[in-house]
């Protein structure tokens, strides 16, 4: 049904939905916080511009009653629910921020005439993909696709002289809703990744991985999973590794790699870490003082969606234009805004940019370095160590099939 | 009326130390990062050193490990603190805050203090 929208007349308002269904076990006072200082920062930006409305956010909760599993399996109900609730109080704000979860984003994308923008702190998964009013302010699974793909075709980088085309995919269910999406991306077999590859098979039991360490009819040397080390550490273990094998360990929102004090544990030495740029500190920031890594991001895509929707805000005032219209739902994309950390690019789709970087462990050191970059917006990659201290053969990383070329 | 007021320039002896600072009026310092360009004799301005709102910070290449950037938000200042010094640092330094503008950094700069270091 049609909402009207409090979003005229020099009051603008933006719908906070805090679901209790959730891409990160985020307390929503966290979040409470990061919007709040994220609306104290619009007010001034648009004092400064001479424009003198009013920015407010409302934050609808969901009862809890029935979706309450706390992750997002349930999301999917809980999304629509709330979105009954903002219509029957016929209280739409000029924004709607909030669904992080897939299910739950793209359930109400699907259910809903979009005429006002949605931005999401997740919505990870490829059904998210291509939605003309959605904004996504955490990295898609989509995006790390596109990097997998460029880096097992690059072959012409002194430490990857082989093009790759080939890998198994550990997936055993258990994932964090980040995880879930990028690795259900690799499965999928309609799939960018999938296209490209030659062979690709899902691992999904922990001894079906444990096998293929020293497996000698392995089908491929390359193994990606995601998570933390603590993660491989608990299904690795100690175990003997070939020396040709390479795991790709996805773990995008998690930059204690970085930390000066950090030594690599030694079974990382067969590793190749792939995170995000360092740089979400939030030093001065109340909501984020106690905050692990990954909700850090998470709070951080809440603070820098409002500071998306004031940039837009502005533009459209200072140009007399108005906002409860289709042009301002579909412009929150192929633009780059000043955002609490730095500048924050969305592409063409809405989905965020950034600089993904691949890290090894040197075998001199034990210490994580950076390999390469990886710039999601020109989907190009950059060399960092032209001379890297691997632990293979060489210093070169492996063919991706044993015995095809020289190890 | 936006005001960016720098001071702390002066005469340092190459591998010498200064320490810039620039108050900003409330309403800019609480809603933009900050940055510090420079501009020496016959030269085009360069930016020298940036500060986002949540502290984080991104310097120029020339001057990394050797200048530190940092904002005291109850003073609404933002400083530039500036070791081992080389004579091709001498240059007038400015204040630079408020919304990015496309052409030249952000919409409001000071009025610029002059470094010079030589010996």
């Known amino acids: 049904s049609q909402v009207s929208q409090n979003c005229h007349n020099g009051s603008y308002e933006i719908s906070v939905l805090m679901m209790g269904n959730s891409a990160f076990a985020e307390p929503l006072k966290n979040l409470e916080d990061a919007v709040n200082e994220g609306l104290e920062i619009v007010r001034g930006r648009l004092q400064n511009a001479g424009l003198n409305v009013t920015v407010n956010a409302t934050f609808m909760y969901s009862d809890g009653l029935i979706h309450n599993s706390g992750d997002c399996r349930s999301s999917t109900c809980e999304g629509l629910d709330l979105l009954r609730k903002i219509s029957n109080a016929q209280r739409m704000g000029c924004v709607l921020i909030g669904p992080s979860c897939t299910y739950s984003t793209f359930q109400m994308y699907l259910d809903t005439e979009l005429s006002y923008p949605m931005i999401s702190a997740g919505s990870f998964g490829l059904s998210c993909d291509y939605k003309e009013t959605l904004t996504r302010l955490m990295s898609p699974a989509r995006k790390l696709m596109y990097f997998l793909v460029n880096f097992w075709k690059t072959n012409d980088l002194p430490f990857k002289t082989y093009s790759w085309s080939t890998s198994y995919v550990y997936k055993n269910g258990t994932e964090t809703e980040d995880c879930f999406w990028y690795l259900n991306a690799l499965e999928a077999s309609v799939s960018y990744f999938s296209h490209e590859l030659g062979f690709k098979v899902v691992l999904r039991q922990d001894k079906e991985f444990q096998d293929i360490l020293m497996d000698h009819n392995r089908k491929s040397n390359v193994i990606i999973m995601c998570g933390g080390p603590e993660f491989l550490y608990k299904l690795k273990g100690d175990r003997a590794v070939a020396e040709d094998i390479v795991i790709i360990l996805v773990d995008l929102f998690n930059d204690q790699y970085f930390e000066d004090n950090v030594t690599a544990p030694d079974y990382m030495k067969n590793v190749l870490v792939l995170t995000l740029s360092p740089g979400n500190s939030l030093l001065n920031s109340s909501f984020s003082r106690n905050l692990s890594p990954t909700k850090r991001d998470f709070a951080l895509a809440y603070l820098n969606g409002i500071l998306l929707f004031g940039h837009m805000l502005k533009i459209f005032l200072e140009n007399g234009e108005n906002i409860t219209t289709p042009k301002f739902a579909h412009a929150f994309r192929n633009l780059t805004f000043e955002g609490y950390d730095g500048p924050v690019t969305l592409d063409d789709w809405g989905d965020v940019d950034s600089t993904m970087v691949l890290l090894y462990t040197s075998v001199d050191t034990k210490k994580y370095k950076v390999l390469l970059t990886y710039d999601t917006h020109v989907n190009k990659t950059y060399p960092v160590d032209m001379s890297p201290t691997f632990t293979w053969k060489n210093s070169k990383l492996p063919n991706d099939i044993t015995g095809r070329g020289p190890q | 009326q936006v005001q960016l007021v720098e001071s702390g320039g002066g005469l340092v002896q190459p591998g010498g130390s200064l320490r810039l600072s620039c108050a900003a009026s409330?309403?800019?310092?609480?809603?933009?990062?900050m940055d510090w360009y420079r501009q020496a004799p016959g030269k085009q301005r360069e930016m020298v050193a940036t500060?986002?709102?949540?502290?984080?910070?991104t310097y120029t290449d020339a001057v990394k490990g050797r200048f530190t950037i940092s904002r005291d938000n109850a003073k609404n200042t933002v400083y530039l603190q500036m070791n081992s010094l080389k004579p091709e640092d001498t240059a007038v330094y400015y204040c630079?805050?408020?919304?990015?503008?496309?052409?030249?950094?952000?919409?409001?700069w000071g009025q610029g203090t002059q470094v010079t270091v030589s010996s």
């Open positions: 630079n805050a408020g919304a990015p503008t496309a052409s030249s950094g952000r919409q409001y």
């Open positions: 409330s309403n800019i310092f609480r809603a933009y990062g």
């Open positions: 500060i986002w709102l949540s502290g984080r910070t």
